[in-house]
């Protein structure tokens, strides 16, 4: 399949985001691209978000969707928000070329995210 | 419309060698990872082998079955793949597709191998 | 090397029949799974892409599902014309991409 890069960590904001780039390397010309992120944990691959976009334009996530992203060329930037520490594992990206054939399908070797959840603020008395 | 026409196919005594060839049409041949998957008679399909593209640097990988025997090469110029089979066995006898991507198939061609 | 299970290896079903065949793979796949159709004498034709899409020209009542390790081929409504053999393929790199054993559908 074709090569999908990512970074290996990614530490999440004290605001729970988390942004990492994912490239790939395209064998052909294609006009219509998919990117899914995966969390993968243990043997279980829950689909986390996913958009399909036409090349040069915008990638467009659903309204209710924790992921945001930009594209360029072959490299998507992807955003994850209202991550907490239970979600902290393993973030799979994972590219189809969509249109025209032929059909490519690349899978990253992911990156493991680490959410800290923010210490709550101590009382004050003022 | 697209075509894929594989040729080279007959009967062959074992350890000898035949090359197959398969001619594409209809479709950005040099955007197309090519792939050989093989059917032995009254058998399931099995993948042989593959050859990658330019901008991956034409990498090839093949089955363990006819790895070390059999080598894949493609002229983008001409959009035609070949299929060198080499020390060929009687268990190679099959019919023989070329694929693009694997969204296109040939027709086939039929390789036997026997003495 | 992943290895993929297909099942059953062969079925009878009537016309207008809901269908369901089943390839597992050994290792978590992310859905990097193609269906094939086979009609007697023919070559094989891609049918489902990337476990869920259908290729064009493929018929609605067939649709794809699954994954991680598990994935389904459901035709809706059995037709004559659906006799054939149904193929899963592994596309997930590294090579090989193995194929499943294949399964026979006729009709009763």
């Known amino acids: 399949a074709m090569h999908v890069a990512q970074p290996a960590v990614v530490l999440a904001s004290s605001r729970g985001i988390a942004s990492f780039v994912c490239e790939y390397a395209s064998p052909g010309k294609a006009t219509e691209v998919r990117v899914t992120v995966l969390r993968q944990a243990d043997s279980q691959v829950t689909e986390v978000c996913a958009a399909t976009y036409m090349m040069g334009n915008e990638l467009t996530f659903l309204d209710d969707s924790i992921c945001t992203g930009t594209s360029s060329g072959n490299q998507v930037n992807l955003t994850i928000q209202g991550l907490r520490a239970m979600d902290t594992g393993l973030y799979i990206c994972k590219v189809e070329l969509m249109y025209p054939p032929p059909y490519y399908l690349g899978i990253g070797n992911g990156t493991q995210i680490y959410v800290i959840d923010p210490e709550p603020c101590p009382d004050s008395d003022f | 419309e697209v075509q894929l026409v594989e040729s080279g196919g007959g009967l062959v005594q074992p350890g000898r060698s035949l090359r197959l060839s398969c001619t594409a049409s209809?479709?950005?041949?040099?955007?197309?990872?090519m792939n050989w998957v093989r059917q032995a008679p009254g058998k399931g399909l099995e993948w042989v082998g593959q050859?990658?593209?330019?901008?991956?640097?034409?990498?090839?990988y093949y089955s363990d079955s006819v790895k070390g025997r059999f080598t894949i090469s493609r002229d983008d110029s001409k959009s035609i793949v070949y299929l060198q089979m080499n020390s060929l066995k009687t268990e190679d006898t099959a019919v023989y597709y070329c694929?693009?991507?694997?969204?296109?198939w040939g027709q086939g061609t039929t390789v036997t191998v026997s003495s | 090397d992943i290895q993929m299970t297909q099942s059953p290896s062969s079925l009878s079903a009537s016309v207008g029949d809901r269908v369901t065949i089943t390839c597992g793979a050994s290792?978590?796949?992310?859905?990097?799974l193609n269906w094939y159709q086979q009609k007697p004498g023919k070559s094989p034709k891609l049918l489902i892409y990337?476990?869920?899409n259908l290729a064009d020209g493929m018929p609605s009542r067939f649709s794809g599902s699954g994954s991680g390790r598990d994935y389904t081929l459901t035709i809706s409504s059995l037709q004559p014309e659906d006799v054939a053999t149904y193929y899963c393929?592994?596309?997930?790199?590294?090579?090989?991409?193995?194929f499943g054993g294949g399964t026979k559908v006729e009709i009763k």
């Open positions: 694929t693009g991507g694997m969204d296109y």
């Open positions: 209809g479709f950005t041949f040099s955007d197309n990872w």
């Open positions: 050859i990658r593209n330019k901008p991956y640097n034409y990498e090839t």
């Open positions: 290792e978590i796949i992310y859905g990097a």
């Open positions: 990337g476990a869920t």
């Open positions: 393929q592994k596309i997930l790199s590294p090579p090989p991409w193995t």
